[in-house]
Amino acid sequence: MAVTACQGLGFVVSLIGIAGIIAATCMDQWSTQDLYNNPVTAVFNYQGLWRSCVRESSGFTECRGYFTLLGLPAMLQAVRALMIVGIVLGAIGLLVSIFALKCIRIGSMEDSAKANMTLTSGIMFIVSGLCAIAGVSVFANMLVTNFWMSTANMYTGMGGMVQTVQTRYTFGAALFVGWVAGGLTLIGGVMMCIACRGLAPEETNYKAVSYHASGHSVAYKPGGFKASTGFGSNTKNKKIYDGGARTEDEVQSYPSKHDYV
């Protein structure tokens, strides 16, 4: 029950996170005009990853796309790439995790397969979240650098009475959406990975006695197969080295591949 809840919650949190990453990537307000030096401007500028916009006080908003690839700063291209990779990985992760959900039965899919898929989607969510956080952080760093550079050059060329105030940009709403969304996707991924441990088929303890067969040093289990799966370490024939009879409890259990996340 706890596993199902953890997995379900991880899926929902990741879903919200990825929706947020998509929203942040599409938003125009990655950077907004800093109004500290000119709070009475009648024109407000803001920029996104794909276009820049100008909102006039009169209510008119004009947006222009960046219709060039080569002319854009490498950092902006990098941020775009990180966000897109984050979205793609997240989308694939969501698709995989839908099939991995314990509450959804698809054919005769075994728990080990669901565990694998849960782990895979969890890792994808973690990487997706990290991509979004990295992308937003790179953009934020770029803004901070440019902000202080433009502050230093703010009144350059003030030969006479005329002032030319450079437009400075500060953090836009999309950055905060991106950070939160990336964090949620990351948390969702971690939850999926935790849920994966609980989904992994565990050793079932059978109190059946293993008998040493003459001529073979192999222990046979009577009816020792799991009802629903053909996998798991219990189905393996285990070698008994001392030739004596012992209960299955005493036989060393080999670690499952899902025991370590």
Partner: antibody, heavy 117, light 113 residues
């Protein structure tokens, strides 16, 4: 078509409050801003203030303590209130709609307000 | 506040001749976001309200004859009437539409020589 019409008392006593109304038609009050501009007799234009579509206002720095601009969307009206008037406030008062580039693209005919005792 | 200075105060030009009015702002009116200058030109005839001629320094308002043109960037702007007509006699004002208060220039009175 867009129309603006100013109305109000033509004569106001010094130290009283000047109240004007601008009745508009042909555009949405929630989408566009309206500015108030005055012109003293024989002089140039002076921008007083503006109320935007979202209800926010901006006033001329010299009049900020005396000027209030508001709107009544249900009546399609904008109003200007200028307190503690003096003879220097005698002018033709215009209301005008803000358009592209924040430019004033439609103007009312104006109303002359004289401040005198 | 941005101070708008117009020159000359008055101008007399012969019919059919070119008329040029200048406007200078104390701060740049160029918006870096869209590379547009937030300067507007108005025409006011006696007894009438002002009429919008040009916004964004060079964009003609619809219905305005093409003999009117605006130019300039940053702090220096010009309104040009390529061939003066009798109906162009008026006072012309420039306005800062970039920063509040949206100040007007002092006006230039255009007459026929």
């Amino acid at each position: 078509q867009v129309q603006l019409q100013e109305s109000g008392p033509g004569l106001v006593k010094p130290s009283e409050t000047l109240s004007l109304t601008c009745t508009v038609s042909g555009f949405s009050l929630t989408s566009y801003g309206v500015s108030w501009v005055r012109q003293p007799p024989g002089k140039g234009l002076e921008w007083l203030g503006v109320i935007w579509g979202d209800g926010s206002t901006n006033y001329h720095s010299t009049l900020i303590s005396r000027l209030t601009i508001s709107k009544d969307t249900s009546k399609s009206q904008f109003s200007l209130k200028l307190s503690s008037v003096t003879a220097a406030d005698t002018a033709v008062y215009y209301c005008a709609k803000a358009g592209r580039g924040n430019a004033l693209d439609y103007w009312g005919q104006g109303t002359l307000v004289t401040v005198s005792s | 506040d941005i101070v708008m200075t117009q020159s000359p105060d008055s101008l007399a030009v012969s019919l059919g001749e070119r008329a040029t009015i200048n406007c200078k702002s104390s701060q740049s009116l160029l918006n870096s976001g869209n590379q547009k200058n937030y300067l507007t030109w108005y025409q006011q005839k006696p007894g009438q309200p002002p009429k919008l001629l040009i916004y964004w320094a060079s964009t003609r308002e619809s219905g305005v004859p093409d003999r009117f043109s605006g130019s300039g960037s940053g702090t220096d702007f010009t309104l040009t009437i390529s061939s003066l007509q009798a109906e162009d006699v008026a006072v012309y004002y420039c306005q800062n539409d970039y920063s509040f208060p949206l100040t007007f220039g002092g006006g230039t009175k255009l007459e026929i020589k």
